[in-house]
């Protein structure tokens, strides 16, 4: 277990020409807040997939009113860190989305209005327990500067927060079976710690962070008794018995998620999975439209002219995700056929074809034997994108132009002498051997170990190999 911490340093116009206008005005004062979404790994997850590592929403920043005629400065930020607690191991590699939101405080009918100012996304490697990492990301004309780190919650330690350490009880050594906790040599590895909150009476664990229930109890922390009577609308099945759960009050009762969000219980609270266009702890932040510029990397926003209609981003080749925020490894789709080498040039895919193949995707099999003559009665055989000649007896080489020496490979065994012949080779066997290649010994009593010599051919006579 541990906490991912994000510190926003500044949000304002990026360098270069075309500074953005301030998002707030005297007529329409506003304030900023931030949302961070974390997903494990560097995998190409769909952008709309849930923030599996966790998400957090900052407090609202100070109210800001633009000074007439002044360029947009760095905007006032909310106080404090954004903290995303993680329950299990820190994955080491993670994907993040940081969104900058504007809350307009003018005379809005029905309260304040929210709009997305900028969204940045990235993938990083980070060890827990390390120093703050600094980053700068640009979204259009805006620039976001921030730092982040992952730290373990005691007693967890290590780069993944999977090792558990406690202070030594004795000054010299750790308890039986427990090793010192490098690099914290003054601490010892701790016995297994179950998931935080796991019922000590009704739960147990075999792996750190898990909570397995004894029979008759269920729920993520084994605190919910299983009812043996049948029930019509159980909250969920029990892994321990076939009974039903006593409905009991739960964090998702009454569905705290607004705007059609779906609620799922977490050990400490609940999590809302929001439909496209809605964000926030309870999906209360709404109304992302094409006017908010949700499409990145040259994506075109289609539809979504008003808050009630969902937008779609048409992504340029090479990008995907609901906001075109993820680069596609187009070569991973293996578009080049017949063993061609794929090159993603950014503006286009190229296939470098093997010999004998052509076309944009190496899809055309060239006629390998077209215009290829095999000499001396050889025949052309296609295959593998290259032509090959099957040569007549006595000839070899790529085009059967070379006269083969049938004796070059020393084919006669047991000291037999080889003679080239117009139809192949002849082996003159040494005394005691026979066969086309002199491979069979002749027994002393005159019987051969294998088939008898053909009629009229005595052992020791030359054998012609056809």
């Amino acid at each position: 277990a541990g906490v991912f911490e994000l510190q926003i340093h500044s949000f304002g116009p990026g360098p270069g020409p075309g500074a953005p206008r301030s998002p707030c005005s005297a007529r329409l004062p506003c304030r900023l807040f931030f949302r961070v979404c974390l997903k494990p790994g560097l995998s190409e997850e769909a952008a709309e997939s849930p923030c599996a590592l966790g998400a957090a929403l900052s407090a609202r920043g100070p109210v800001y009113t633009e000074q007439p005629g002044a360029p947009a400065p760095d905007l006032p930020l909310p106080d404090g860190l954004l903290q995303v607690p993680f329950r299990d191991a820190w994955p080491g590699t993670f994907s993040f989305i940081i969104e900058t939101w504007r809350e307009e405080l003018g005379d809005q009918i029905g309260g304040p209005a929210w709009s997305l100012l900028a969204r940045v996304a990235g993938r990083r490697r980070l060890a827990a327990g390390g120093p703050w990492a600094r980053d700068i990301q640009r979204a259009g004309a805006w620039e976001l500067r921030f730092s982040y780190r992952a730290r373990c919650e005691p007693p967890a330690v290590g780069t993944a927060c999977t090792r558990l350490c406690r202070p030594r009880s004795a000054p010299s050594r750790c308890g039986p079976g427990l090793r010192p906790c490098a690099p914290l040599e003054d601490e010892c590895e701790a016995p297994l710690v179950c998931r935080a909150g796991c019922s000590p009476e009704h739960g147990f664990c075999e792996q750190p962070g898990e909570c397995r229930c004894l029979e008759g109890w269920t729920g993520p922390l084994c605190t919910v008794p299983v009812s043996t009577s049948s029930c019509l609308s159980p909250r969920g099945p029990s892994s321990a018995t076939t009974g039903c759960l006593v409905p009991g009050p739960g964090p998702c009762d009454g569905n705290p998620c607004a705007n059609g969000g779906s609620c799922s219980e977490t050990p400490r609270s609940f999590e809302c999975t929001c439909p496209r266009g809605f964000y926030g702890l309870r999906c209360e932040v709404s109304g992302v439209t094409c006017a908010d510029g949700p499409c990145f990397n040259g994506g075109l926003c289609v539809g979504g002219a008003d808050p009630d209609s969902a937008y779609i981003c048409h992504c340029p080749p090479g990008f995907q995700g609901s906001n075109c925020e993820k680069r596609v490894d187009r070569c991973s789709l293996q578009p080049c056929r017949n063993g061609g080498l794929c090159l993603d040039l950014g503006h286009a895919l190229r296939c470098r074809c093997r010999a004998g193949f052509a076309g944009p995707r190496c899809e055309h099999d060239l006629d390998d034997c077209a215009g290829r003559a095999c000499a001396n009665g050889g025949t052309c055989v296609e295959g593998g994108g290259a032509h090959r000649c099957s040569c007549a007896l006595g000839f070899g080489g790529r085009d059967c132009r070379e006269r083969a020496d049938p004796c070059a490979a020393r084919p006669c065994a047991h000291g037999g002498r080889c003679y080239a012949h117009f139809s192949g080779l002849v082996c003159a066997c040494a005394p005691g051997y026979m066969g086309a290649r002199c491979e069979f010994p002749v027994h002393p009593d005159g019987a051969s170990a294998l088939p008898a010599a053909p009629p009229g051919l005595r052992p020791g006579d030359p054998q012609r190999y056809l």
């Epitope: 080749p317 578009p335 503006h347 944009p360 995707r361």
Partner: antibody, heavy 118, light 108 residues
């Protein structure tokens, strides 16, 4: 070198369907979006629609009910059909390639004039 | 849809002079998704600038683009004889893709 060439009849009768084909050379049709744009004589440019080889299309709402864009990857071609034409559809019709950096047009055909007249 | 208004409609200048063409959007164009094209009589348009300020391949450096939000500018620092043409802006932030009405740069 990327080249685009429009082809199709230069004269179409009112209420009929205008059909044009764009043949692409020097680029794989599977690697880009492809678009049609038109320009009435002496006027500005109007985007008609685009297509991706996967079949994704997007049309200008002002023409959507009459437009169909299709693609033939085997011939490296894409086509435009505009139904129920009137004299207001008389224009030079351009086919163009959409760039990878965004939905702007980096290569254009030389254009073909289509006149709608009886 | 985003409506692009170009001004002036016609610009009469001499070779060697500086030309400044304006393109104003009815709504903010996000991430500066704006392109400029040049069109000569009887020819197809030619891409000059994309991303509001990035020059396309092979475009001379006398052409430059600037601006953000709703106001964009194409500047030709010293007009050459071959620069007299019609110039169009185009936004590609959201659908439908739209062009400005064009600015004709003619010889004075």
């Amino acid at each position: 070198q990327v080249q685009l060439q429009e082809s199709g009849p230069g004269l179409v009768k009112p209420s009929q369907t205008l059909s044009l084909t764009c043949t692409v050379s020097g680029a794989s049709i599977s690697s880009f979006y492809w678009s049609w744009i038109r320009q009435p004589p002496g006027k500005g440019l109007e985007w008609i629609g685009y297509i991706y080889y996967s079949g994704t299309t997007n049309y200008n709402p002002s023409l959507k009910s009459r437009v169909t864009i299709s693609v033939d990857t085997s011939k490296n071609q894409f086509s435009l059909k505009l139904s129920s034409v009137t004299a207001a559809d008389t224009a030079v019709y351009y086919c163009a390639r959409i760039a990878v950096a965004g939905f702007f047009f980096d290569y254009w055909g030389q254009g073909t004039l289509v006149t709608v007249s009886s | 849809e985003i409506v692009l208004t170009q001004s002036p409609g016609t610009l009469s200048l001499s070779p060697g002079e500086r030309a400044t063409l304006s393109c104003r959007a009815s709504q903010s164009v996000n991430k500066n998704y704006l392109a400029w094209y040049q069109q000569k009589p009887g020819q197809a348009p030619r891409l000059l600038i994309y991303g509001a300020s990035s020059r396309a391949t092979g475009i001379p450096d006398r052409f430059s683009g600037s601006g953000s939000g709703t106001d964009f500018t194409l500047t030709i620092s010293r007009l050459e004889p071959e620069d007299f043409a019609v110039y169009y802006c185009q936004q590609y932030d959201r659908s439908p893709l739209t062009f400005g009405g064009g600015t004709k740069v003619e010889i004075k």
